[in-house]
């Protein structure tokens, strides 16, 4: 039969979890459309394009788990959704929050 091919629609990027320093966060990426089903590649948009060393990526589900986030985890992240006939991207800005010093009276 005839197979209809559809490029990935613009994916949606979002953060799950607290952005406080030391927390674990999950970066989520998904396209509503795409035949065959897209795979997802996350990269950090700095000079290395590498994810932090504490990150694990699932290219099928479109998730990245970053454990024990630090100030070095902050920055722009890009998800590229791709299949046989096209690619589409979304961006996410992760800003890790440092704890505010408490005044001791």
């Amino acid at each position: 039969g005839l197979t209809v091919l559809v490029p990935p629609s613009a994916p949606h990027c979002q953060i799950q979890g607290s952005q406080d320093i030391g927390s674990d966060v999950i970066l989520l990426c998904s396209s509503e459309e795409g035949i065959p089903r897209p795979t997802y590649l996350w990269e950090k948009l700095d000079n290395t394009l590498k994810l932090p060393p504490t990150a694990t990526q699932d290219q099928v589900q479109g998730t990245v788990t970053i454990r024990n986030i630090s100030a070095l985890s902050s920055g722009l992240y890009q998800c590229v959704a791709s299949n046989a006939i096209g690619t589409s991207t979304c961006l996410l800005d992760l800003q890790v929050i440092s704890p505010q010093p408490r005044n001791i009276g």
Epitope: G75, L76, Q78, C90, L91
Partner: antibody
């Protein structure tokens, strides 16, 4: 297809008011921060104002603070700029633009609407 | 506010030339630097985001580099449709959002 269409520009006297609109289509409007950027004749780009996707946070350039008000109606997919106490130096083409992420790069722009402040 | 300074303000070049435009930030902006192209009477168009990432649909002759305070936009082989004004923009501490003053690329 993402489209942004500005309207409401025109000729106004110094001290007068004008309301610009930007009709958005082709994307989930409430998910994106939006900005107004202007360009005076023969000059460079100047950011004017920004608003969060929900409309709960607004930001202004010092040059327009207290005179301009940015707002949005997510049910109508429309962005607004209310301009009061207009000055000659506000004369410019006003663009609405979509922030791709947070308040980062502008990935889509409208065609612009010209505001002329002159007596 | 972060100030963005572009150089040169204008340049003359021929088709096929390699063109380099620089942008300097008044303080470190990491990789939060974007480049736009604007032609007369038209809205700006995003070329490069995050200092070096090419926007979809933009020809590969355009490239960006740099981080911190110093950034470069390079056109490897200038084409007739590339004659335009180019702007850098920082999105590190934004809002406020700041642009460079622009670089006009003219035909020699």
């Amino acid at each position: 297809e993402v489209q942004l269409l500005e309207s409401g520009g025109g000729l106004v006297q110094p001290g007068g008011s004008l309301r610009l609109s930007c009709a958005a289509s082709g994307f989930t409007f409430s998910s994106y921060a939006m900005s107004w950027v202007r360009q005076a004749p023969g000059k460079g780009l100047e950011w004017v104002s920004a608003i969060s996707g929900s409309g709960g946070s607004t930001y202004y350039a010092d040059s327009v603070k207290g005179r301009f008000t940015i707002s949005r109606d997510n049910s109508k997919n429309t962005l607004y700029l209310q301009m009061n106490s207009l000055r000659a130096e506000d004369t410019a083409v006003y663009y609405c633009a979509r922030h791709w992420v947070s308040y980062g790069p502008f990935d889509y722009w409208g065609q612009g609407t010209l505001v002329t402040v002159s007596s | 506010d972060i100030q963005m300074t572009q150089s040169p303000s204008s340049l003359s070049a021929s088709v096929g030339d390699r063109v380099t435009i620089t942008c300097r930030a008044s303080q470190s902006i990491s990789s939060y630097l974007n480049w736009y192209q604007q032609k007369p009477g038209k809205a700006p168009k995003l070329l490069i985001y995050a200092a070096s990432s090419l926007q979809s649909g933009v020809p590969s002759r355009f490239s960006g580099s740099g981080s911190g305070t110093d950034f470069t936009l390079t056109i490897s082989s200038l084409q007739p449709e590339d004659f335009a004004t180019y702007y850098c923009q920082q999105s590190h501490q934004s809002p406020p959002i700041t642009f460079g003053q622009g670089t006009k690329v003219e035909i020699k």
